[in-house]
């Protein structure tokens, strides 16, 4: 059941100052974990595990909780004030330019290169040329060209919202 709180229920120091464009003092901002009512007079609680709001707001609706995809693990559940935190499973990572999905980490570096960074939930293994020390980025090499290594363990969570 959604709880209902009014601006008057908030302690004076918590009460949000109404925005200038608003005419009524009751039409201010609602605290995290709530959204504003249709008439702007009340704050309505988000539903735990279903939706959330992270900041003081005048949102008509709370935001839908993210559901972790297959290939992801849930590090922390959605609460009324914080979205779900999902992380790629061990051996996979999420790139900045394709945040929708976790990709498999490479199992090793091309011949002539050495691994200097492990697979993490947010990065592939890192390879550098033995001689020059320059980083390698490109296609996954053919199997016979690889030096195998096991995926690294996660170091810290990678949060995705929405």
């Amino acid at each position: 059941e959604s709880a209902l709180i009014t601006q008057q229920d908030l302690a004076p120091q918590q009460r949000a100052a109404p925005q200038q464009k608003r005419s009524s003092p009751s039409e201010g901002l609602c605290p995290p974990g709530h959204h504003i009512s249709e008439d702007g007079r009340d704050c309505i609680s988000c539903k735990y595990g279903q939706d959330y709001s992270t900041h003081w707001n005048d949102l008509l609706f709370c935001l839908r909780c993210t559901r972790c995809d297959s290939g992801e693990v849930e590090l922390s559940p959605c609460t009324t004030t914080r979205n779900t935190v999902c992380q790629c499973e061990e051996g996979t990572f999420r790139e900045e330019d394709s945040p929708e999905m976790c990709r498999k980490c490479r199992t090793g570096c091309p011949r002539g290169m050495v691994k200097v960074g492990d697979c993490t939930p947010w990065s592939d293994i890192e390879c550098v040329h033995k001689e020059s020390g320059t980083k390698h980025s490109g296609e996954v090499p053919a199997v016979e060209e690889t030096v195998t290594s096991s995926p690294g363990t996660p170091a810290s969570p990678c949060s995705l919202s929405g």
Epitope: I36, N57, D58, L59, L60, F61, C62, R64
Partner: nanobody, 123 residues
Amino acid sequence: EVQLLESGGGLVQPGGSLRLSCAASGRAFSNYAMSWFRQAPGKGLEFVSAINWNGENRYYADSVKGRFTISRDNSKNTLYLQMNSLRAEDTAVYYCAAALSFRLGGEPYGDAYWGQGTLVTVS
């Protein structure tokens, strides 16, 4: 990204009814709050109605309250606006929009996606 396409507009007599549809494609429709805006000839954009991601919460502008009903079918990726007791002042191009939420005044929260609009003429 979400693509939105409105349909269902047309010419109707005062007191008549129309049902607008907004078909969504692309990213998960059910993650988004949806809304209808309208723009009358020579006027600005007006926030008409909005609905949350699962259809449990709805908002209506005073000008349409009791006459318009917003709904959504997440299994069909479609938003609807049932318009009854239409008046001449409802004549406008109607746009659907998707966003994570909408603020009390209608401003989308986060990235917003818009349809091309469908014309409703009440005459």
